[in-house]
Interface confidence: medium
Amino acid sequence: SGVFQLQLQEFINERGVLASGRPCEPGCRTFFRVCLKHFQAVVSPGPCTFGTVSTPVLGTNSFAVRDDSSGGGRNPLQLPFNFTWPGTFSLIIEAWHAPGDDLRPEALPPDALISKIAIQGSLAVGQNWLLDEQTSTLTRLRYSYRVICSDNYYGDNCSRLCKKRNDHFGHYVCQPDGNLSCLPGWTGEYCQQPICLSGCHEQNGYCSKPAECLCRPGWQGRLCNECIPHNGCRHGTCSTPWQCTCDEGWGGLFCDQDLNYCTHHSPCKNGATCSNSGQRSYTCTCRPGYTGVDCELELSECDSNPCRNGGSCKDQEDGYHCLCPPGYYGLHCEHSTLSCADSPCFNGGSCRERNQGANYACECPPNFTGSNCEKKVDRCTSNPCANGGQCLNRGPSRMCRCRPGFTGTYCELHVSDCARNPCAHGGTCHDLENGLMCTCPAGFSGRRCEVRTSIDACASSPCFNRATCYTDLSTDTFVCNCPYGFVGSRCEFPVGLPPSFPW
């Protein structure tokens, strides 16, 4: 569909005569009839197959014709057509004299014709006006013409229909050849597919409008390139959705069991060395001068009772000093100037001469010790408490205060690792020398029976159209990650495609 446009420029009839040679009275009141038809090698009378148009009276004798000229006429003249433009045409332009106001053919005398021109040729669709001029013995007509397409028609022959749109069915404008040109942010054959946010993950993200990035189940982040770990995962990460891969030093189904208490909590004080010894269990090896489960207590150097023979100990900045009783000397009052004659043994100790009476030795009764039986026996000096237990004197006896995880008189027994029921999903726990072992029921595996194996919701391949299946361990259900173009809990529905368009 298009329009043949004819622009009349100038008509010259200097003598004001008709084609017969007869002059017009008082002058030739000139109007035009135009006939457009298919190409003929010799233009002949007959139907105006492409259309006809007439003008009102445009002037007298010689005159120039302006755009949208006065008198109600349209210039350029419009000859619309509703077919594919063939690229060739024939054109007949007749100039007539109107003696009165009635311009109908039957109302005019037969000799009212002033001039008649006929041309034929090639004409491509385009904006350019093609200039032409025809001269006869008495008249001259200058005009130009072109063919343009109607609104929404495009191409070399105005045969291609294209209507711009910006709605659910497409987002485009039309190019000069009728092809679609997508609006910014849209792509696809009919410009229906939004262009997602730059960098939006191809599989894990999608969009319903341009510059958007919506995440499929199991994915998160601005570009949908971060997986969502298992619900409740504390100290773990994932590489695919719903995983919980524990960070170093953590264990358990949700990576919430601390396997590296030393690093995470630094419990040992005063420069002590920390050793992990199980879940939330540790041992501190104290530096000299410190004691306590966490080496939090500072030892006085006199606490070890270094002064013998009843010597009294005095703490000093750089150590300690023994004040010896009469008859003793040395760093620890270990040397005696006494003999058995001086009755040096206390608390009922019996004296024995040595080195021909130059020295002696005391044999102490139970509960007393020291070179002169001057000290009550400290039952803790032998460090009887195992596994870092703390020894406490209780009168004539002693007792051990055990660290968590140990029991027994001397803290020599491990509290059963199985007491905490560490095996998940009904697993059976076995205490071992260095830890425990879980025997898992059918359908579970892993150190603590935390991994489901046989009950796999994805095993039945529930997802359609090449979707990726993920098992949600916490609910025994599956999640389908749909490829582009499919929706539904199992990706079973194709996204509705538009009806095909005629262009």
Partner: antibody
């Protein structure tokens, strides 16, 4: 890209004829009018005539009427200008020029490179 | 005798402005569009201005055109040495039914 490529320089004797060609490309040949314009050494531009490439209709300047013939070959997209009865004052550069037309007159928008015609005995 | 006349020459220093007039009549300039062409030495003319005041793509805005009655004017601002050329106006003459060109103006950059 619109291009008009003309034939090479010619040397002619007085009384002879010369035919200059102008090959068009980069646009629809039949949708435009082709003008011919000449320029004698040190002189202004002088319009000679035009041809409607769609239907072959021609219009000539009164100064050259009877001596100039403009034709076209639509299949070769080429226009021709033939000038006969050459005289020494016809020595000039001859240009073909494409014309666009609108309601206010024609507009020469692209020119050939020119062809020098020398008329000398 | 030409129907459209121009001054033979104009000159100005670099960076200055020059104007070239084109004088005609009602049968040409007054009732038809005017075009301006630049012809550098030894080359074909090149379209500078069409439809009185429009510039084709690639022509800098230093070149401008205007029309009033039977006269048209070409203005060149920020004159450059590369602007040294002959400048012609062109229009349609209805009475001659012919394309007509002005007599041409040589622009010299001092």
């Amino acid at each position: 890209e619109v291009q008009l490529v003309q034939s090479g320089a010619e040397v002619k004797k007085p009384g002879a004829s010369v035919k200059v060609s102008c090959k068009a490309s980069g646009y629809t040949f039949t949708s435009y009018t082709m003008h011919w314009v000449r320029q004698a050494p040190g002189q202004r531009l002088e319009w000679m005539g035009w041809i409607n490439a769609g239907n072959g209709n021609t219009k000539y300047s009164q100064k050259f009427q009877g001596r100039v013939t403009i034709t076209r070959d639509t299949f070769a997209s080429t226009a021709y200008m033939e000038l006969s009865s050459l005289r020494s004052e016809d020595t000039a550069v001859y240009y073909c020029a494409r014309s666009r037309y609108n309601s206010g007159g024609s507009l020469v928008d692209y020119w050939g490179q020119g062809t020098l015609v020398t008329v000398s005995s | 005798q030409s129907v459209v006349t121009q001054p033979p020459s104009v000159s100005a220093a670099p960076g200055q402005k020059v104007t070239i007039s084109c004088s005609g009549s009602s049968s040409n300039i007054e009732n038809n569009y005017v075009s301006w062409y630049q012809q550098l030495p030894g080359t074909a003319p090149k379209l500078l201005i069409y439809d009185n005041n429009k510039r084709p793509s690639g022509i800098p805005d230093r070149f401008s055109g205007s029309k009033s009655g039977t006269s048209a004017t070409l203005g060149i601002t920020g004159l450059q040495t590369g602007d040294e050329a002959d400048y012609y106006c062109g229009t349609w003459d209805s009475s001659l039914s012919a394309e007509v060109f002005g007599t041409g103006t040589k622009v010299t950059v001092l």
